[in-house]
Interface confidence: medium
């Protein structure tokens, strides 16, 4: 028998520095977790203790903090090289800055293979990107070889900016011939490493003949066997065992997100490459694990540029940006409009001639807007200003909801109106009218939404049975501020870009902004 240790991360999302327990900015260092310096300590410790170790990343290193905003992927290549990752799969967020923003900082600088079997380049890009990412890689591990085959969510064109010269094929269809090729090369131990979410990971384990282990990402799935060590609730045991169509037991793993855990899976293979046993658990990277001093020193060196960046002007406002709770928790506020407009702008993807865009709607809890920005400071807006408005380090995500769920959400928005509570919704691409004289749960008297399947966008009444795409904060997607109906009834959820980054990019693009209060939210019958 031959034993392999798979160490794995996924959805790190720019958390190079240690974070608080909820993966936001580290405040009390003695209680902080994760970060590449701490990860390196644990990886080194395991590499010294065990003979056959692979360190793998299942995508979405890009996007999530000011580190990515400033360094644009150079930080990912630098620190992943320093940790000596063995392979990485491309995630959807690796395309956030377009194909060039992937090629130059990461693909050309990485000293490890970057993989995806279901992304096919065409046209002029094909020769430019050739060899910079691969469908699979055969890695020597001790005296043996292991094949790693990559995959990426086929939804990437709707979630990021891969451009028109990359085709995202069905994962299973694309993986099978690559695995077959590995078999003909006498590689009998094969790991599928990819970024399509836990449901697809399980399907790959079931359907792709010859895959021995699946290491996934995208859905931020936390698996654990036994008593979990922190706040995350396991979606199943680690590893999650899938019985393949040809009767094999295939372990599937994922390691939550944000570098909080290091996935740790031990696999025993027989001489024919069959999995005899698999066990392990994610390792919580808490403060009991020291940060490696050399990596920490490097982080501190790179940090200097971030501190400079946060005080630089992004753009100007010529109007007061009203982010006060007195406004945003009671009525339409222009800060809410600005943020929602930025959220929609960030999700412009012209992927189909029938649609002007795939999504037109935004909702945003007023309680998530934490500060106004005064225009009387020469109109200057900095990252620091935006961090005061959006201090929680969240993301603006894409969900699919039925009209009936949206209606419930808007009823919830005003079910206890007048108490300055955070659930009052700011909107974009939506016109809502409330009648507060009616009883809670029946206060939405008009709800019109901006069409997407149209050449001239206009507002149409919400249809209860129709499925709509909506951009919203991850806080709401996870049921925050009492929006349990969103969490319970959403049909799809894809994590998006860092909230501050979305707004800062929009302001930089517009240069001068002047958002107005324009009648997106109205109150009828003189009740307000």
């Amino acid at each position: 028998a031959w034993e392999l240790t798979i160490l794995h991360t996924n959805d790190v999302h720019s958390r190079l520095e240690q974070t608080s327990e909820d993966s936001s900015k580290c405040v009390n260092a003695s209680r902080c977790m994760g970060g590449v310096a701490r990860l390196f300590t644990k990886v080194q410790q395991i590499r010294r203790a065990e003979p056959n170790v692979l360190l793998l990343d299942a995508g979405d290193q890009y996007q999530g903090t000011i580190w990515f905003t400033v360094y644009k992927g150079a930080e990912v290549a630098h620190f992943m090289n320093a940790l000596r990752y063995d392979a990485m799969a491309l995630g959807n967020h690796e395309f956030d800055n377009g194909v060039e923003g992937l090629i130059e900082p990461l693909l050309k600088e990485a000293k490890f293979p970057i993989l995806s079997a279901n992304i096919k380049a065409k046209g002029p890009l094909a020769s430019q990107i050739s060899g910079l990412y691969l469908p699979y890689k055969v890695l020597p591990v001790g005296d043996e070889v292991v094949g790693i085959v990559g995959y990426t969510s086929k939804e990437t064109p709707f979630l990021s900016n891969p451009g028109t010269n990359l085709v995202f094929e069905d994962e299973i269809t694309a993986l099978q011939p690559e695995v077959d090729k590995l078999k003909t090369l006498n590689v009998n131990k094969i790991i599928a490493l990819g970024h399509s979410g836990f449901e697809m990971d399980k399907l790959i384990a079931q359907k792709v003949r010859g895959v021995d282990v699946v290491v996934g990402g995208h859905s931020n799935t936390f698996l654990y066997t036994g008593n979990p060590p922190s706040k995350e609730v396991p979606a199943g045991k680690y590893p999650f065992i899938v019985t393949s169509d040809d009767g094999r037991k295939v372990p599937v793993v994922q390691a939550y997100a944000f570098g909080k855990y290091l996935g740790y899976l031990k696999i025993e293979f027989d001489e024919r490459g069959n999995v005899i046993s698999s066990h392990g658990n994610p390792i919580l990277l808490n403060s009991s694990i020291p940060e490696d001093p050399s990596i920490k020193a490097d982080i501190n060196k790179w940090r200097i540029k971030l501190d400079n960046y946060s005080t630089q002007e992004l753009g100007k406002t010529i109007v007061y940006l009203d982010g006060s709770s007195q406004s945003c928790r009671f009525r339409e506020c222009n800060m809410g409009n600005l943020i929602c407009d930025a959220m929609i702008n960030n999700n412009l993807r012209h992927t189909d001639e029938m649609f002007w865009n795939h999504v037109s709607m935004c909702i945003l809890n007023g309680g998530g807007i934490r500060s106004p920005i005064d225009e009387r400071n020469n109109g200057t807006i900095t990252w620091e200003n935006l961090a005061a408005v959006l201090p929680f380090g969240g993301t603006f995500d894409l969900v699919q909801l039925k009209g009936s769920t949206l209606k419930k959400a808007f009823e919830h928005s005003v079910h206890r109106y007048g108490q300055s509570t955070g659930e009052f919704l700011q909107v974009g691409g939506i016109h809502v009218v409330y009648d507060l004289s009616r009883k809670p749960g029946d206060r939405v008297v008009k709800l019109d939404v901006l069409c997407t399947k149209c050449r001239v966008p206009s507002y149409d009444p919400l249809k209860m049975d129709e499925v709509y795409k909506v951009i919203l904060p991850n806080f709401l997607a996870n049921g925050g501020d009492g929006f349990q109906m969103i969490k319970d009834e959403l049909l799809r959820h894809d994590s998006g870009d860092q909230d501050i980054n979305v707004v800062s990019t929009y302001i930089s693009k517009m240069k001068v902004i002047y958002p107005a209060v324009e009648g997106r939210i109205k109150f009828s019958t003189g009740s307000h």
């Epitope: 410790q45 590499r47 065990e50 170790v53 020291p290 490696d292």
Partner: antibody
Framework: DVQLVESGPGLVAPSQSLSITCTVS????????VSWVRQPPGKGLEWLGV???????NYHSALISRLSISKDNSKSQVFLKLNSLQTDDTATYYC???????????????WGAGTTVTVSS | DIVMTQAPLSLPVSLGDQASISCRSS???????????LHWYLQKPGQSPKLLIY???NRFSGVPDRFSGSGSGTDFTLKISRVEAEDLGVYFC?????????FGGGTKLELK
Amino acid sequence: DVQLVESGPGLVAPSQSLSITCTVSGFSLTSYGVSWVRQPPGKGLEWLGVIWGDGSTNYHSALISRLSISKDNSKSQVFLKLNSLQTDDTATYYCAKTNIFYDYDWYLDVWGAGTTVTVSS
Amino acid sequence: DIVMTQAPLSLPVSLGDQASISCRSSQSLVHSNGNTYLHWYLQKPGQSPKLLIYKVSNRFSGVPDRFSGSGSGTDFTLKISRVEAEDLGVYFCSHSTHVPWTFGGGTKLELK
């Protein structure tokens, strides 16, 4: 000049705990590891565990429940604590500088003279 | 745990002879980083062990060039080209490929 000096109690009663200190000079405990190895009288060598420069540890699986290794970098001291002693824990206990270059090279390059520990009532 | 087996148990030599000690591991000592963590130590009577060779064939500083190490995978050899009096003692091979690190039982190099 690299030196390691072990200091221990000499005699320990069964079921008690053993504490040994290794005081080092000529190198920094933040840059190198220190391992503990023991040798029963007239027998071979048994590796017990290691503490690395970053403070992380690896232990022999057979001893993991009763062994702990810690250190004080500022005092250049490494500590071994072994609980629930039995007579077969009688041995000479050595600490050894463990050369480390990231996770490429590691080996015990300089050893202390050892301290003899007898477990007996 | 990896078992390290040394042969012979005892090796009687005359000064100036060549000596060869064999060490075999129960599984491959090749680490996934490409290194082979097989080391040789000499323990003289009443002293602590001293490092001679690290990672199969690298002489530690101050070790005379009459000592050489070779081998790969699971089979390794320590050779002393011309034995001198100061070379007498017990030689141990050891691996540190993964935890727990283990030692061979030792080979006693003694005068005939």
